[in-house]
Amino acid sequence: MAQGTLIRVTPEQPTHAVCVLGTLTQLDICSSAPEDCTSFSINASPGVVVDIAHGPPAKKKSTGSSTWPLDPGVEVTLTMKVASGSTGDQKVQISYYGPKTPPVKALLYLTGVEISLCADITRTGKVKPTRAVKDQRTWTWGPCGQGAILLVNCDRDNLESSAMDCEDDEVLDSEDLQDMSLMTLSTKTPKDFFTNHTLVLHVARSEMDKVRVFQATRGKLSSKCSVVLGPKWPSHYLMVPGGKHNMDFYVEALAFPDTDFPGLITLTISLLDTSNLELPEAVVFQDSVVFRVAPWIMTPNTQPPQEVYACSIFENEDFLKSVTTLAMKAKCKLTICPEEENMDDQWMQDEMEIGYIQAPHKTLPVVFDSPRNRGLKEFPIKRVMGPDFGYVTRGPQTGGISGLDSFGNLEVSPPVTVRGKEYPLGRILFGDSCYPSNDSRQMHQALQDFLSAQQVQAPVKLYSDWLSVGHVDEFLSFVPAPDRKGFRLLLASPRSCYKLFQEQQNEGHGEALLFEGIKKKKQQKIKNILSNKTLREHNSFVERCIDWNRELLKRELGLAESDIIDIPQLFKLKEFSKAEAFFPNMVNMLVLGKHLGIPKPFGPVINGRCCLEEKVCSLLEPLGLQCTFINDFFTYHIRHGEVHCGTNVRRKPFSFKWWNMVP
């Protein structure tokens, strides 16, 4: 039960006080008691419940005709059952007794009022009155947790605007309102109550730039909403009529959780006594609601795809046809960014990561725009953000970034359990250097901080700086599976490729050619690849780098060897000993449910079939997956990327609600 104020009574004159329903009000009967009195008794109107405890040990008893010793160990508390119809209509009488004096009476006139700030603290999608049920001032995780949730209103419901909805002080329409969380102030007071009292709604100065609150005129159009709290306004006096009244507020978050903001916002209503114009307002009562800002959540390859994105560039029509066919098979929408908008930047995966935010009443896809800012710079903000599609970005928008700040270097695992700890939304994966040096690359700290601050997908740092491009999607992917953990981790594997090529040579296919059928590309015989000592050394190094990540992933995702599939792949070390795929990197695939778009490796053709394709199909088809090999050689591969790098996917949000987990 909420804490009320302390009321001091005195025999000299009647005391007038306000008691808010649902609060426990302390009654000080000792400090002004007549000197010679040693005991007291209390009588109260039927609407007042008086509790007297004498301790220690505390003996609690409701009032009757008993007398109680007048000593500091006696605690008297009041609660009120109903709101008053008129001011001071509930009475409490204290009678003081002494051995030689007649009883002395002190009178207390109480006004019972109902003041309650309600939000969806039970996370049902509905605001229910919660007075005296739960403490709204705490926010707790887990299925039995409580606490309201706010969405960053980061979409753009107004197509004529270039800004996010949370960047203005207006409510556009009912669509805009749905992105906000409802908070209701319920009051029940005597008619004349607010002639001597005021209610003020407020937020801590440290949080005022993270939230905006609109007051709605009940029953009217959303255009009647006016901003009452926000970056410029930490407090707002409310004009409340006496009697029974409900006031609706719509709350939007303006910022995602981050290093300097844990994501919690407390809104407080304060009841002030303004009866004495000569004196400052006195606080009579406060009620608070704590909101947590919904985190940005990534979706793994195991989530059903809903929309595929790719770029149209010079001569990639065949690539786009393949992606279109794949999207149709997977029943996905397809969005193509035209040449004039991508400015010859085809790396859709690197520009953005599509996740979502969720409150009990609303789920919203949100695009996280990377700071790489090349030709696709405007695409997320101009073409992806829109009605019910939010936007967020982090990191420096001009310079100061590395290749590791592109979002091919940002992936998320499917849900896992690691040594008994559940990650029901999976874990974020991004690449880093294995140790800092003058020229090592790392994901920008602002990006790392943002990802960690979301709390629900605890990030794992992998080692990717050994790669020329440096992205985790160059050596790993996840595919759905019908058994075990519901997925398999795919890892690029030079060892597996050498084994396959050695088997083919042993069977007399040493003359078979890699890159056969590719114009202007020097073909390589299996026997030459196997005998090239430098290439062996390069791949031995690469294998060590991938094995380091393999062990890291097994440990941090709780995986067994049987959860991992090795995809045959060779690399070569280029300038500054950075690795690049020797032939199209098959692990860099597009995963659309059971349909996989895999870079066509142009491996040695044996008995009419590419042995690399055949091997990969034999590994993945038993999982119910369908492999489509896409020719990306000249349009993507030789430009240091593949199918995954050149595409992006919006996926269905998890059915698991993030607030039900315990980070």
Epitope: R441, L573, F576, I638
Partner: antibody
């Protein structure tokens, strides 16, 4: 073959900044590694910085690290050298140079470590 | 002071051969095959004449040859001609924190 032209040099006070540009013609610069090399008046060559074709990693000489930033815009067929906190000892002719990536070798022969195409240079003078 | 050591000057008569040495360490010349040589005439940009220790770009006469032994690389110019008079610089990839090093340059005079 690609031709390179440097620009952006000039006189600047110590502590000042300059941005050098290297524009390519005759070929697509995105196929090339690019380095900046400088030569102080009457002195030898000094390697300054490198950027790979994919624009994913960069390297710097100890003498300029933290002050200079190399970048590229493949759409504009250009590479840039942003020079901040300039010192008198940065006075030099700055050359832009490139090497084509030989995609046909089984193992790359390290073309990023040498420069087979050079621009004519742009003079940077740091003096108060 | 340059990281790779070259003689300040060498000279030779037309038709003769000259060799310019370039001495590094086991962390650069001795470790990698990424040694290259450049020719620079006064007031001009340098020109690549040898890469990967001994390979010649197309258009470079076969009078220019390169080799390496231990931590020392060498450029040999046979059948000297007047137009060979120039400054010559060696370069190598390095394990050090500056990954490409140059020699201090050698002035070749054709007598």
């Amino acid at each position: 073959q690609v031709q390179l032209v440097e620009s952006g040099g000039g006189l600047v006070k110590p502590g000042g900044s300059l941005r050098l540009s290297c524009a390519a013609s005759g070929s697509t610069l995105s196929d090339y590694f690019v380095s900046w090399i400088r030569q102080a008046p009457g002195k030898g060559l000094e390697w300054v910085s490198f950027i790979n074709q994919a624009n994913t990693f960069t390297y710097y000489a100890d003498s300029v690290r933290g002050r200079f930033t190399i970048s590229r815009d493949n759409a504009k067929n250009s590479v840039y050298l942003q020079m901040n906190s300039l010192r008198a000892e940065d006075t030099a002719v700055y050359y832009c140079s490139s090497a084509n990536d030989d995609v046909d070798d089984i193992v790359a022969p390290g073309r990023g470590y040498y420069m087979d195409v050079w621009g004519r240079g742009t003079l940077v003078t740091v003096s108060s | 002071q340059s990281a790779l050591t070259q003689p300040r000057s060498v000279s030779g008569s037309p038709g003769q051969s000259v060799t310019i040495s370039c001495t590094g360490t086991s962390g650069d010349v001795g470790r990698y095959s990424h040694v290259s040589w450049y020719q620079q005439h006064p007031g001009k940009a340098p020109k690549l004449i040898i890469y990967n220790v001994y390979e010649r770009p197309s258009g470079v006469p076969d009078r220019f040859s390169g080799s390496k032994s231990g931590n020392t690389a060498s450029l040999t110019i046979s059948g000297l001609q007047a137009e060979d008079e120039a400054d010559y610089y060696c370069s190598s990839h390095s394990r050090s924190s500056t990954p490409v090093l140059f020699g201090g340059g050698t002035k070749l005079t054709v007598l």
